[in-house]
């Protein structure tokens, strides 16, 4: 029952994960415009991965994607390739979880196959979780770069009449998002590693015997022998000589911690 | 047809309050910001601030904090706008004003005339 | 607040001149995210309240003559009539519409000889 539980949950942890990481993709607010130190500004500006807008004080809001390819920053393009490998390992992720599940029989598929499966989803949801991670933090110390190189700019040729507001740009909400989002797909690919290690048929599956000889009280234990240790072996012919293969509820799952932001 | 219609001229005795409303119709009153603009006689412009009437979130020029009040009233998309404390610096026509894109102001209301008089 | 200085304070002409108002802004009013400018202009004819011409410096608003255009960058703008009528008597108001508090210039007023 804790293997179901622990796959399940991480399963549904995952999901929830790349559902962010696909959101934060596509959100606008990536960065947004430092409103602290600053005149006020009757307009608001924020950029995404793939467009900038501007939201005017009298509501009008107008973006524009970026329609070059070649003319973006390197740092923006590796960012976009981060995310898209986040997203791609994901959805093929959870494709592959979805036939793992304990709980969804598919034909006459074998444990050890759903221990494989389990243990693939949970490898692809892991790197996912750190592509999504990597590409944040990637955009946000690009972001913190420029923050002080602009205050820097902000403090020097101010000697003339004219001024120019200096827009400076700190973290939007996509990259919290993000975080979460990425931090949530490595718990659930963690935890359905963590399932895996219950899913998969062990070699050794007996409880000691006790076999009393007659007259004495010594107790013979079991040692190194298989079940079947021909090829093609049947695993379903084990439960006959399985005194006490660990059950489901016996898996012990770690308890796993994340921030939230 | 687009329209904003102002309350009429006021004579008013110094140290009391005004409250001037602005109604909007042809349009999406809460769709848009309604801005307030005094004009002194013989004299330019001056923005005094806007209400947003979906939130009834404010801006306000700093000259004019404590002077001037805006509220909505969303069920008659009418704008208000109160001033208190008078003094005859504040007789002046003031217009009620749409807030459109390139945050211009493209609706005007016909004008309120407040003169401040003993 | 941000000064906005308009030049001349008055001037006459006669019908069918070309005519330029100048506004100068003590603070750009270029946003460089989208490449706007936030300046505009209104029409006030005597007992009337202010018209917008233009906004974003050059974008005519509708309904709005051609002969009025708009131009400039940063901190300097011009108003342009291209062929006064005599129904352009009016006074003309550049107005910042990009940091609070939204200032207006102190009005060129346009006479007919």
């Known amino acids: 029952m804790a293997v179901t539980a622990c796959q399940g949950l991480g399963f549904v942890v995952s999901l929830i994960g790349i559902a962010g990481i696909i959101a934060a993709t596509c959100m606008d607010q990536w960065s947004t415009q430092d409103l602290y130190n600053n005149p006020v500004t009757a307009v608001f500006n924020y950029q995404g991965l793939w467009r900038s807008c501007v939201r005017e004080s009298s509501g009008f809001t107008e973006c524009r994607g970026y329609f070059t390819l070649l003319g973006l920053p390197a740092m923006l393009q590796a960012v976009r390739a981060l995310m898209i490998v986040g997203i791609v390992l994901g959805a093929i992720g959870l494709l592959v979880s979805i036939f793992a599940l304990k709980c969804i029989r598919i034909g006459s598929m074998e444990d050890s196959a759903k221990a494989n499966m389990t243990l693939t989803s949970g490898i692809m949801f892991i790197v996912s979780g750190l592509c999504a991670i990597a590409g944040v933090s990637v955009f946000a110390n690009m972001l913190v770069t420029n923050f002080w190189m602009s205050t820097a700019n902000m403090y020097t040729g101010m000697g003339g009449m004219v001024q120019t507001v200096q827009t400076r740009y700190t973290f939007g909400a996509a990259l919290f998002v993000g975080w979460v989002a990425g931090g949530l797909t490595l718990i659930g690919g963690v935890m359905m590693c963590i399932a895996c290690r219950g899913l998969a048929p062990e070699e050794t599956n007996y409880k000691a015997v006790s076999y009393h000889a007659s007259g004495h009280s010594v107790a013979y234990k079991p040692g190194g022998f298989k079940a079947s240790t021909g090829f093609g072996s049947n695993t379903k012919n084990k439960k006959i000589y399985d005194g006490g293969a660990r059950t489901e509820d016996e898996v012990q799952s770690y308890p796993s911690k994340h921030d939230y932001v | 047809e687009i329209q904003l219609q102002q309350s009429g001229a006021e004579l008013v005795k110094p140290g009391t309050s005004v409250k001037i409303s602005c109604k909007a119709s042809g349009y999406s009153f809460t769709g848009y910001n309604m801005n307030w603009v005094k004009q002194s006689h013989g004299k330019s412009l001056e923005w005094i601030g806007n209400?947003?009437?979906?939130?009834?979130?404010?801006n306000y020029n700093q000259r004019f904090k404590g002077k001037a009040t805006l509220t909505v009233d969303k069920s008659s998309s009418t704008a208000y706008m109160q001033l208190n404390s008078l003094t005859s610096e504040d007789s002046a026509v003031y217009y009620c004003?749409?807030?459109?894109?390139?945050?211009?102001?493209?609706?005007w209301g016909q004008g309120t005339t407040l003169t401040v008089s003993s | 607040d941000i000064v906005m200085t308009q030049s001349p304070s008055s001037l006459t002409v006669t019908a069918g001149e070309r005519v330029t108002v100048g506004c100068k802004s003590r603070?750009?009013?270029?946003?460089?995210?989208?490449?706007?400018?936030?300046l505009s202009w209104y029409q006030q004819k005597p007992g009337q309240p202010p018209k917008l011409l233009l906004y974003?410096?050059?974008t005519r608003e509708s309904g709005v003559p051609e002969r009025f255009t708009g131009s400039g960058s940063g901190t300097d703008f011009t108003l342009t009539i291209s062929s006064v009528q005599a129904e352009d008597l009016a006074v003309y108001y550049c107005?910042?519409?990009?940091?609070?508090?939204?200032?207006f210039g102190s009005g060129t007023k346009l006479e007919i000889k």
């Open positions: 004003a749409r807030h459109v894109r390139g945050n211009s102001f493209d609706y």
């Open positions: 209400i947003n009437p979906y939130y009834s979130n404010t």
């Open positions: 107005q910042n519409n990009y940091i609070y508090p939204f200032t």
């Open positions: 974003w410096t050059s």
């Open positions: 603070q750009s009013l270029f946003n460089s995210e989208n490449q706007k400018n936030y």
